[in-house]
Amino acid sequence: DAHKSEVAHRFKDLGEENFKALVLIAFAQYLQQCPFEDHVKLVNEVTEFAKTCVADESAENCDKSLHTLFGDKLCTVATLRETYGEMADCCAKQEPERNECFLQHKDDNPNLPRLVRPEVDVMCTAFHDNEETFLKKYLYEIARRHPYFYAPELLFFAKRYKAAFTECCQAADKAACLLPKLDELRDEGKASSAKQRLKCASLQKFGERAFKAWAVARLSQRFPKAEFAEVSKLVTDLTKVHTECCHGDLLECADDRADLAKYICENQDSISSKLKECCEKPLLEKSHCIAEVENDEMPADLPSLAADFVESKDVCKNYAEAKDVFLGMFLYEYARRHPDYSVVLLLRLAKTYETTLEKCCAAADPHECYAKVFDEFKPLVEEPQNLIKQNCELFEQLGEYKFQNALLVRYTKKVPQVSTPTLVEVSRNLGKVGSKCCKHPEAKRMPCAEDYLSVVLNQLCVLHEKTPVSDRVTKCCTESLVNRRPCFSALEVDETYVPKEFNAETFTFHADICTLSEKERQIKKQTALVELVKHKPKATKEQLKAVMDDFAAFVEKCCKADDKETCFAEEGKKLVAASQAALGL
């Protein structure tokens, strides 16, 4: 329904606090380099303007679209050309092209300093001195580093962030109370950002149909008792929400997400028996809870799928008359029966079914042609099952760090052109699949592992897209969203790769490594491992293990030495020489 003033409508729906927070997130996600103070100023100006429109919807400019209002505001930034270069050219365009231009300039890997956590007392003082500024700064810092972060969910994170400081800054041992909470928020935040990035990539690179297929599969697993029509309605609404958020329409997105949560809770009897607790929570918690809710129990005595999708005389008629509806029904029926399958596997099965019908419904005897279509699913199901079984065995044998190292070697050999920081980041995350998923029983392993891997490989894809260096990565990332993981799994050693020139500087270490956290120290060692493989892609596991063991011993020895720096300099030279000899460099 049309409103005279869109900005007034959203301000009234969301309330001032959420309105201001969402506008700040939107601006920080667009202009990622702008100082905090500049953004706060812009947000305050927009908020004051919104209030005039609430008072009088017919006031000047109140009828303008949000993109026009926000874009005009962003284009007032004086240093746009110096700070952002060609992004400033967006301001010469008209809507909707201007907004599209801003979206295209979002940077998944902005050149921003790492967020360093101050001392607890310093943080608590800042929190007490100006709580509002402290929380705004949190939104700003997260949003600019994660330009696709799901905005309504970031409001939920900010609420938890505030609660942590409110509780812990009064505690006897502030650090013991606060630090684990902040660690949890950081880890959950990174995961949330990566999951949302995949949703946006799905919509932007593969289109609405791909996202809707993903949503049908996931919601059907989660709400197996819901009718197809109900699932379809939820999918349509959810698609609108994510399209808006991925398109920078954060006010509309947050508003529509709240409406969707309200609808789900009002209709929970026909959706899922697991929603009761979620629906008793306040809005932000409610929406988060619904998004994470466990799968409902499958209805008893579901009939065989073959009756409707193989044996029925209407198969080709249904496919011809309403292709997407019919395939949606297939996906719904398959997914609700298989909470043990990953969403991407379910989508592969649906694609196989679609391809078979496309071919068979044009054949002389369609039924004879597609009668055995379900037999084609067997190898597709077994492939991820076997892969997960093998990798969980390897993980249990090695532990997380060494499992990550195995993946580092594996992926560096597959795509050695990719930058070392990206290979380290992606492989470390791939390696986390072990501790995240291998503890689960068989029935939960595949959805946990393969859908998580889809999220991580999407990180590789978006980072690689910024500076493409490997045709193989481009191919796996762009050909098929659901076959990304099998595509990467199938890659063998890149025989065309010319080994990197040896550079002793890459393998020179200093005493500062001793003061790093265990995680940072691991990253240093893993960076060295990637570089080793890039120098010697044909090195065997045994050779690499020997060098890495020597390296670990060298770090341990020098960190215990009285004169650490001298130890690193002298022993380091010996280690490099020994490694070169061991690897035949």
């Epitope: 009718e227 197809f228 009939p303 008629k317 008359e321 309403a322 292709k323």
Partner: antibody, heavy 120, light 113 residues
Framework: ELQLVESGGGLVQPGGSLRLACAAS????????MHWVRQAPGKGLEWVSG????????AYADSVKGRFTISRDNGKNTLYLQMNSLKSDDTAVYYC?????????????WGQGTQVTVSS | DIVMTQSPSSVTASAGEKVTINCKSS????????????LAWYQQRPGQSPRLLIY???TRESGVPDRFSGSGSTTDFTLTISSFQPEDVAVYYC?????????FGQGTKVELK
């Protein structure tokens, strides 16, 4: 085997009411659009009404709008047509037909029809 | 409403002869998003219920003999019986499903010469 069996037809006076039923079997009833089509004596086919059995969404011909109501019970796999304020023009054989997944899909299966006679 | 007009209103044919029935819609029944024509053809033999022959203008329903074929697009459609058989004596109807209300043509009666 797919079957559609209509019942509830009969003789009724103008202004009266009748409720037709169509019992469906042999397919997943809650998937398809189901329709009522009528045929006056010696005349052609006339679409009366349709319902999306999944969503409950309905559609009517102008000639019956406001007088007839289509409904379904997915638990019983049954389609209904409540006919009120009947007129002599409503005299016809009423067929229940199984449509497609969308309103425009062809009607692949038909019942044997039930006779409705509106006369004083 | 979309008006469907069939021609001729009746036709007589000998066994083995080719029979052509035309159907014209007052508006396009071509759905732009999937490029499909939502037009169907039905056969109604004397004393029987209608039977679907063709859907989406040209797709033969399973079990329908291949002497029946449909063609055309947008507003002009044709049902062809390539070699008329005595069991094909019936009234044939076209129907559009593009828009609600769904509408049928007035019918074409096909008799044996």
């Amino acid at each position: 085997e797919l079957q559609l069996v209509e019942s509830g037809g009969g003789l009724v006076q103008p202004g009266g009411s009748l409720r037709l039923a169509c019992a469906a079997s042999g397919f997943t009833f809650s998937r398809y659009w189901m329709h009522w089509v009528r045929q006056a004596p010696g005349k052609g086919l006339e679409w009366v009404s349709g319902i999306n059995t999944g969503t409950g969404s309905t559609a009517y011909a102008d000639s019956v709008k406001g007088r007839f109501t289509i409904s379904r019970d997915n638990g019983k796999n049954t389609l209904y047509l409540q006919m009120n304020s009947l007129k002599s023009d409503d005299t016809a054989v009423y067929y229940c037909a199984k449509g497609g997944l969308v309103v425009g899909g062809g009607y692949s299966d038909w019942g044997q029809g039930t006779q409705v006679t509106v006369s004083s | 409403d979309i008006v469907m007009t069939q021609s001729p209103s009746s036709v007589t044919a000998s066994a083995g002869e080719k029979v052509t029935i035309n159907c014209k819609s007052s508006r396009s029944v071509l759905y732009s998003s999937n490029q499909k024509n939502y037009l169907a053809w039905y056969q109604q033999r004397p004393g029987q219920s209608p039977r679907l022959l063709i859907y989406l203008a040209s797709t033969r329903e399973s079990g329908v003999p291949d002497r029946f074929s449909g063609s055309g697009s947008t507003t002009d459609f044709t049902l062809t019986i390539s070699s008329f058989q005595p069991e094909d004596v019936a009234v044939y109807y076209c129907q559009q499903g593009y828009d609600v209300p769904v509408t049928f043509g007035q019918g074409t009666k096909v008799e044996l010469k």
